[in-house]
């Protein structure tokens, strides 16, 4: 039994790290393999993760970690029974993939403005709580080419856009994701999307801005 692609891990920097790797051939990950991990610290327990299959030869493991600090370092040992297949280490703060934002809501009753709000997925005592910025994706349900991304580079989990920038009488969807620049993180997964109907009507004058000239012969 051989490891083809060594484990690579990402952390949500609150409680969960996810490691993925590929084996040399078809493997029943949960029956044949164990990933043992331990925080390098005075008082730390040895933890064991039972991997799941991710394709025929791919394995994925969800590592539970507590109360992370920036200096944390974990030893990782991949075992097949009594055989040590791979040994490595993992520093969560250097491989951050934030949790996805939650509770995305679209308010359409603000005059001519769409207000999108969502919640920061971290509690206030977590380092990432004040570090996240966001990207909001809005798209037309019936026209995949009508899609745009808004970068929210401030920390407030809200976005205001003019309803007039979207097509009238069309259903739109939005989703949001997060990243932490200061930790050089990757983007989070997208949040679940939310749907609304853009009922905004353009002012009458905009429809009739051209003038009719009558010529007399």
């Amino acid at each position: 039994m051989k490891v083809l692609q060594e484990p690579t891990c990402v952390s949500d920097y609150i409680s969960l790290s996810t490691c993925e790797w590929k084996m040399g051939g078809p493997t029943n990950c949960s029956a044949e393999l164990r990933l043992v991990y331990q925080l390098v610290f005075l008082i730390s327990e040895t933890n064991m993760c039972v991997p799941e299959n991710n394709g025929a030869a791919g394995c994925v493991c969800h590592l539970f970690m507590e109360d992370m600090v920036g200096a944390d370092n974990y030893t990782l040992d991949l075992w097949a029974g009594q055989q040590l297949l791979w040994k490595g280490s993992f520093k969560p703060s250097e491989h951050v993939k934030p949790k996805a934002p939650e509770n995305l809501t679209v308010y359409t009753n603000v005059s001519e403005t769409l207000l999108l709000t969502w919640s920061n997925p971290y509690p206030p005592d977590n380092y990432l709580y004040e570090k996240l910025t966001y990207a909001v994706n809005i798209w037309n349900e019936n026209d995949p080419t009508d899609s745009r991304i808004y970068d929210v580079t401030y920390q407030e989990p809200t976005l205001r856009i003019a309803a007039s920038t979207l097509k009238s009488g069309v259903s739109y969807r939005a989703r949001v994701r997060a990243w932490a620049q200061s930790y050089n993180s990757t983007w989070s997964e997208w949040s679940p999307s939310t749907k609304w109907y853009n009922a905004y009507k353009e002012p009458f004058e905009k429809h009739h801005h051209h003038h009719h000239h009558h010529h007399h012969h």
Partner: antibody, heavy 116, light 112 residues
């Protein structure tokens, strides 16, 4: 052996500031959160705040916001807490504690007495 | 802020008897990672507090097995099965799940 050695007792005037220190031995403070806990004479324990010494990220109980400032120097393995604009209500023993992820190691405490 | 209410304030016990201390939180203290960071500390006169129990039920290393923790949600209990003279002091519960972290008011265990 794991130890948290705190600075000695301090007698300070009302309105002044004081900076308490807490030096760790037997472990690296970067591997834990460093907390401070207040204990007024003959009273209970009150959580003040904490720091992650790796990145300096601090969080405080709201009543100590503006009163306490927690810092850390990883090169000397020391955590600090500065208390400002002292009043008689700040007279207490202040404990530094490392938490990972519970309060396993406590300093001996520093008595701060505020008196004219 | 989460209020941690301990009862009784004072607990007179005979040596060898069982003692029970209650701690009630004003709201759930389950952390977003699923753990309940409810701890018990003992402070003896002139000393700093010492950890007895973490995550509701786990005894810290070196803590005698006569100490046990139980509970869930908002109600927690520390039991000492056979009180010894060295157990005297003030017991504090503590929640480390939600900022600001908070201690209970303390229960003084004394000899009857």
């Amino acid at each position: 052996e794991v130890q948290l050695q705190q600075s000695g007792a301090d007698l300070v005037r009302p309105g002044a500031s004081v900076k308490l220190s807490c030096t760790a031995s037997g472990f690296n403070i970067k591997d834990t959160y460093m907390h401070w806990v207040k204990q007024r004479p003959e009273q209970g324990l009150e959580w003040v705040g904490r720091i992650d010494p790796t990145n300096g990220y601090t969080i405080y109980a709201s009543k100590f916001q503006g009163k306490a400032t927690i810092t850390a120097d990883t090169s000397s393995n020391t955590a600090y807490m500065q208390l400002s604009s002292l009043t008689s209500g700040d007279t207490a023993v202040y404990h530094c504690v490392s938490r990972r992820p519970w309060f396993a190691y406590w300093g001996q405490g520093t008595l701060v007495t505020v008196s004219a | 802020d989460i209020l941690m209410t301990q009862t009784p304030l004072s607990l007179p016990v005979s040596l060898g008897a069982q003692a029970s201390i209650s701690c009630r939180s004003s709201q759930s203290i389950v952390h977003s990672n699923g753990n309940t960071y409810l701890e018990w500390y003992l402070q003896k006169p002139g000393q700093s507090p010492k950890l007895l129990i973490y995550k509701v039920t786990n005894r810290f290393s070196g803590v005698p097995d006569r100490f046990s923790g139980s509970g869930s949600g908002t109600d927690f209990t520390l039991k000492i099965s056979r009180v010894e003279a060295e157990d005297l002091g003030i017991y504090y519960c503590f929640q480390g799940s939600h900022v600001p972290y908070t201690f209970g008011g303390g229960t003084k265990l004394e000899i009857k």
